[in-house]
Structures are given as C-alpha cells and as structure tokens.
Interface confidence: medium
C-alpha cells in the first residue's frame, strides 16, 4: 500500500520566542528516499528541515530519524518569531536524479501569539 | 452558544436530488471545518464529508464520492450538502458537525434531519 | 483507513454501577481518540478527547483512558441520563475520519 503521511495536528499556536513541535509519522520508510518539512506550497515554498546532514538553525528532529524502524518525522522550532507564521507540510520523496515528490502530509498552520 | 440547525431533509425516490442546509450560530463560522455525518436507521455513525473553513479543501466518503456535494456560504454562515443520484442506502440522519479548531474531533453537533430514499 | 471496533455492543447495567466500554483501533492513533454520547432525539455530544480529557460541562464519572491501539471508556457510576449510545472516533488520519460501531449502555 502506498505510504501515507500523517500531520495529526490542523494547527498550532505559539508565543513568540517560545519552541514548538510540529508532528509527522509515515505509515512506510518505503520507498527509499529522503522527508523534507517545507513552509508554504508550490514554486515559493521554504525548505524548513530535511532528515539529513544538513544544518538547520532553530529547527531539530524530535526523534532520532536515523534509526531503521523510526517512522517519527516531527521537528521542534525553537525561539519562534512572528515570520515563523504559516503551514507547514511534511513531503516524502522517493530517491532518484532528481527525487520525486510522492506525499504530503494535509499541513499544520503554525499560529505566532505575541509575548 | 454554538447552534447547528439542519433542513432539506424529506422523502424521495431512488436517483432524485435533495439538498441539505445547516444554519450556524454562536461562533466564527468562517474559522472552522464543518462535517456531514449521517446516521442510518440502527446502525452507527458513518462520517460522509468536510469542507475547510475557507472552502478550499474538501473531502468526501468514498460511498458518496461523485455524487454528493459539499459547500458553504461564509456570508451567510449556512453549510450545504447537495445529493444527487441518491439510494435506498443514503437514508439516514444527516448531522452537521463543527470540528475543534486543532483537530478533527467534532465538538458541536445538529440535531440532523432525516432524508429517506424509497421507491 | 483505520477501522475501530468497539465491545461490547451492549451492556446491560444497574444505575450506581461501573460500566467500561472499549475501543480497539487496527492500527496505532497514538492518544487522537474521542468519544462522544449519543441519546434519541438529542444532537450527539462530546465526552472525550485526546483519549482522555473531558470535554467541557463533561461530569467527572466520565473517564477516558488508553493510546496506541487499545481505549477505554469509563463511567464510573451510572446515573438515568448515561443511557445512551456511545461511540469512539480516530482523528489521527487525515479523512476518511472513522467512527466505531458503538456500544448501548442499557438499564438492567
């Protein structure tokens, strides 16, 4: 069956300067191939984190993303600010030259409160 | 307090139309997911569809996918459900349900109006 | 689509008594389960969410527990108005949102 990406939450509020976690799980590692979080959708999206060696200021995995059986894609933003605002959408892509977009997850709108 | 008040319920016969209403009250209509779930005569709850609150994203039960619609009118603070093509199996109690702002648990309810499909 | 059966379909029980109903997921939902009650004649209501925090103007004898797979659903003393149809709901999935089949709560 085909891999599923699950974003639990519709939305979350966060104070400013304050971290939050945006959750993720896949049904499926397979197949084969790297999961990326993005803010916004289409041409002008923002890449956010990707479950690789790059460095990513502010945003972390929650879970260790490196282990084999691990199907827990959520990040932590942390001291957010008010440009932080918008959806977030957790995208697995299949690996390949280039890799290929294959499921989103539905979004979760981040809402930033002031202090 | 949050009221949900449903219509358009009625008798028809297999392959007619009706459309249903629910009248929203008591909260920002505009900033919540609204649902259609019905209810057929003794058995559970069977979720039939979601609308955004803006609109753009919709969903429907694969049982009544390509025949019925869902829709909404901010301006008038009113949810839709058109039904085409029914059949005897669509009789039920249609609810129409608020979903929380976070989540998608429903946490008001309509009182739902009965739509019967007999020949 | 994650299907939630529920058991039992029926309980027959005495007002004062305890009555526990479950709600078993085929697959995990982590704590996005709710439960609602539902009674002839009356709009369905909300008792639990997020497998175990009531809803508000909920009575403290409701009591929701569980996660992963397997919820349960307690009233810890039943009073005439708990009499009712109740049903589980996972919100964990993205649509189809799916409901349990439900369990009636019945006067011994």
């Known amino acids: 069956t085909e891999v599923k990406v699950i974003q639990p939450e519709k939305s979350v509020s966060v104070a400013a300067g304050d971290s939050t976690v945006l959750n993720c799980t896949l049904t499926s590692l397979l197949p084969v191939g790297p999961i990326r979080w993005y803010r916004g959708v289409g041409q002008s999206r923002q890449l956010i984190y990707s479950f690789t060696t790059e460095h990513f200021p502010r945003v972390t995995n929650v879970s260790d993303a490196t282990k084999r059986s691990n199907l827990d894609f959520s990040i932590r933003i942390s001291n957010v600010t008010p440009e932080d605002a918008g959806t977030y959408y957790c995208v697995k892509f299949q690996r390949g030259s280039p890799d290929t977009e294959i499921q989103s997850g539905g979004g979760t709108e981040v809402y930033v409160l002031a202090k | 307090d949050v009221q949900l008040v449903e219509s358009g319920g009625g008798v028809v016969r297999p392959g007619e139309s009706l459309r249903l209403s629910c009248a929203a009250s008591?909260?920002?209509?505009?900033?919540?997911?609204m649902n259609w779930v019905r209810q057929a005569p003794g058995e559970g709850l069977e979720w039939v569809s979601l609308?955004?609150?803006?609109?753009?994203?919709?969903y429907y039960a694969d049982s009544v996918k390509g025949r019925f619609t869902i829709s909404r009118d901010n301006s008038k603070n009113t949810l839709y459900l058109q039904m085409n093509s029914l059949r005897a199996e669509d009789t039920a109690v249609y609810y129409c349900?608020?979903?929380?702002?976070?989540?998608?648990?429903?946490?008001?309810w309509g009182l739902g109006t009965l739509v019967t499909v007999s020949s | 689509e994650t299907v939630l059966t529920q058991s039992p379909g029926t309980l027959t029980l005495s007002p004062g008594e305890r009555a526990t109903l479950s709600c078993r997921a085929s697959?995990?939902?982590?704590?996005?389960l709710a439960w609602y009650q539902e009674k002839p004649g009356q709009a369905p209501r909300l008792l639990i969410y997020?497998?175990?925090s009531r809803a508000t103007g909920v009575p403290d004898r409701f009591s929701g527990s569980g996660s992963g797979t397997e919820f349960t659903l307690t009233i810890s003393s039943l009073q005439s108005e708990d009499f009712a149809v109740y049903y589980c709901?996972?919100?964990?999935?993205?649509?189809?949102?799916?409901f349990g089949g439900g369990t009636k709560v019945e006067i011994k």
């Open positions: 997020g497998a175990s």
């Open positions: 349900a608020k979903e929380n702002n976070r989540y998608r648990f429903f946490d008001y």
């Open positions: 609308i955004s609150g803006s609109g753009e994203i919709i």
């Open positions: 709901q996972q919100y964990y999935d993205r649509p189809p949102l799916t």
């Open positions: 697959q995990s939902v982590y704590t996005y």
């Open positions: 008591g909260f920002t209509f505009s900033s919540y997911d």
